[in-house]
Amino acid sequence: QGKEVVLLDFAAAGGELGWLTHPYGKGWDLMQNIMNDMPIYMYSVCNVMSGDQDNWLRTNWVYRGEAERIFIELKFTVRDCNSFPGGASSCKETFNLYYAESDLDYGTNFQKRLFTKIDTIAPDEITVSSDFEARHVKLNVEERSVGPLTRKGFYLAFQDIGACVALLSVRVYYKKCPELLQGLAHFPETIAGSDAPSLATVAGTCVDHAVVPPGGEEPRMHCAVDGEWLVPIGQCLCQAGYEKVEDACQACSPGFFKFEASESPCLECPEHTLPSPEGATSCECEEGFFRAPQDPASMPCTRPPSAPHYLTAVGMGAKVELRWTPPQDSGGREDIVYSVTCEQCWPESGECGPCEASVRYSEPPHGLTRTSVTVSDLEPHMNYTFTVEARNGVSGLVTSRSFRTASVSINQTEPPKVRLEGRSTTSLSVSWSIPPPQQSRVWKYEVTYRKKGDSNSYNVRRTEGFSVTLDDLAPDTTYLVQVQALTQEGQGAGSKVHEFQTLSPEGSGN
């Protein structure tokens, strides 16, 4: 609601104001009535039977102060002209309201020409004879406004031209938009402007411990002519460590926190944090618990995971399948990843070194989310140690690591990959390959072949190369062929048994 600042209140003055009447004593005059043992004062005039009335009542000089537009509230009664037989010709039922601005009080020097008419004041209800005699007078309330005012003060004047009027209340006030707290912003008491369409823009100030949020608009409101605040723009939010309680920002209670300026309340400190003091913006982690840079302050503090729970390394020739189970303690996080590292040791010398460059992983060995990986291209007769480390978002904040190791000895080369290169009615040309790292340890390759279905006899050919042509074979016959590498330490893993068929004599020409 608009705040009214009263400049003049006749009814409240108890007849003490001593307004000027002109002509003196013949027109307007002060009267007193007693109601409920209290004196009620009014200025009245009722010279309805005489024509040519021009009676003036002028207020005392009113200091304008900061007012720009004044509001004039009048409470008055007007008697019905029909109450006065024969007086209808000169009787009126209205009076006129005037004002004059001045920089000084003219005292008793009253000059009508200085006054400007505001309006003719007409009653909504007139008091008829029966009501008047029954003491049921009809009280009218009218309000007018004047502005903008520019001089130090002003007078109001009431001109009677032959009515029967009693003026019970004259209240002159101006309007202010009252001091206001809204959106955690304080808006000062502001004088309402004088022009109806205009709105005075007023900047607000954030209350203690409140701020304009980043990218937000500064709080502003508009003070209308009627003293009402309109069109709020922007707002303030309680800063980190404070929450909104009614129209203020109150420090978070111990054990609670708020990490940013927002509308949200303080939150209870999450798990694995120390009790916070009053006004905390975050809750410190317990010893051994951490927060990753990207973790919200509302998230519990966490710790690195324990080692992978169970790790197996299953050798398959020159391959190893590593399998493990997740850590028993995830550290309170779900962002666990695994890293696999490899170390190889030469049995003869006992010398060891990293083997990342010489082995091949089924998927990149760092940042694994699955719990298995296959490592191939392993060298035969070598000892391998595989380390699987579990990490999460806070592992980088500690120096210790959580890992488990598994060792495996590769006693055989990887089985050769065999291909049929060519064939005739009596021969088969076969080639094979093994991973380059293993080739240096191979002494010879042994090719074993026999007719399919004949389990009693087989033939063996040895060669240092990667191919062989098997001759003196029967036409149109299926042979079972296997290739095995021979090393200084013994036999390597055999290839799988392949079935190759010689050509039939009819098709030999093709």
Epitope: G15, G18, D29, L30, I34, N47, M49
Partner: antibody
Framework: QVQLVQSGGGLVQPGGSLRLSCAAS????????MHWVRQAPGKLLEWVTV????????YYADSVKGRFTISRDNSKNTLYLQMNSLRAEDTAVYYC?????????????WGQGTLVTVSS | SSELTQPPSVSVAPGQTVTITCQGD??????ASWYQQKPGTAPKLLIY???NRPSGVPDRFSGSSSGTSASLTITGAQAEDEADYYC????????????FGLGTKLTVLG
């Protein structure tokens, strides 16, 4: 207590002059309009004149207009009535009276009265 | 006219009620005031406005008005009420500022 004390009456020849005084006490004299009312022997009350609280405004009954002058000295809390060109019909008891509100009364405080006799 | 007319005299037995009237055009516009005057003393205000009594005036005195008439009523008249009574009103004709009635002599019998 609140009172008005009058002085200055007496016998005067027709055409003569007389000045009546009315000393106020017990109230803020400068806040009230003051009147003179007279009463011929055995007759009704007759309003004579009024002066505004600040002394700037006066009004007279037609019967005394131009002959009588009302004045006041607020610093002395005193009201005066200067009567010139007195006539036999001006013979009366003269009362000063306070208008309790406004210019026209009612008259809530009265002086004790002073007799003015105009006779040759 | 600006005259206020009153009956010259009225009498009442002690303890009885008596009404003194006042007639005049001004009374349509303005309330009457009533004054009591005992021989050799100044008038005393009894009633003003709608029906207001100054402090010290007994409540047996009351006033009323209707149209061009105003009335002073004494309910339960007492011997000490024997006096002259004057009505008074602002003058609505503009001829005078204020006018007094012709006065009424109240006699309390016995």
């Amino acid at each position: 207590q609140v009172q008005l004390v009058q002085s200055g009456g007496g016998l005067v020849q027709p055409g003569g002059s007389l000045r009546l005084s009315c000393a106020a006490s017990g109230f803020t004299f400068s806040s009230y309009a003051m009147h003179w009312v007279r009463q011929a022997p055995g007759k009704l009350l007759e309003w004579v004149t009024v002066i505004s609280p600040d002394g700037h405004n006066t009004y007279y009954a037609d019967s005394v207009k131009g002959r009588f002058t009302i004045s006041r000295d607020n610093s002395k809390n005193t009201l005066y009535l200067q009567m010139n060109s007195l006539r036999a019909e001006d013979t009366a008891v003269y009362y000063c009276a306070r208008a309790s509100v406004g210019a026209t009364g009612p008259f809530d405080i009265w002086g004790q009265g002073t007799l003015v006799t105009v006779s040759s | 006219s600006s005259e206020l007319t009153q009956p010259p005299s009225v009498s009442v037995a002690p303890g009885q009620t008596v009404t003194i009237t006042c007639q005049g055009d001004s009374l349509r516009s303005y309330y009457a005031s009533w004054y009591q005057q005992k021989p050799g003393t100044a008038p005393k205000l009894l009633i003003y406005g709608e029906n207001n009594r100054p402090s010290g005036v007994p409540d047996r005195f009351s006033g009323s008005s209707s149209g061009t008439s105003a009335s002073l009523t004494i309910t339960g008249a007492q011997a000490e009420d024997e006096a002259d009574y004057y009505c008074n009103s602002r003058d609505s004709s503009g001829t005078h500022l204020t006018v007094f009635g012709l006065g009424t002599k109240l006699t309390v019998l016995g």
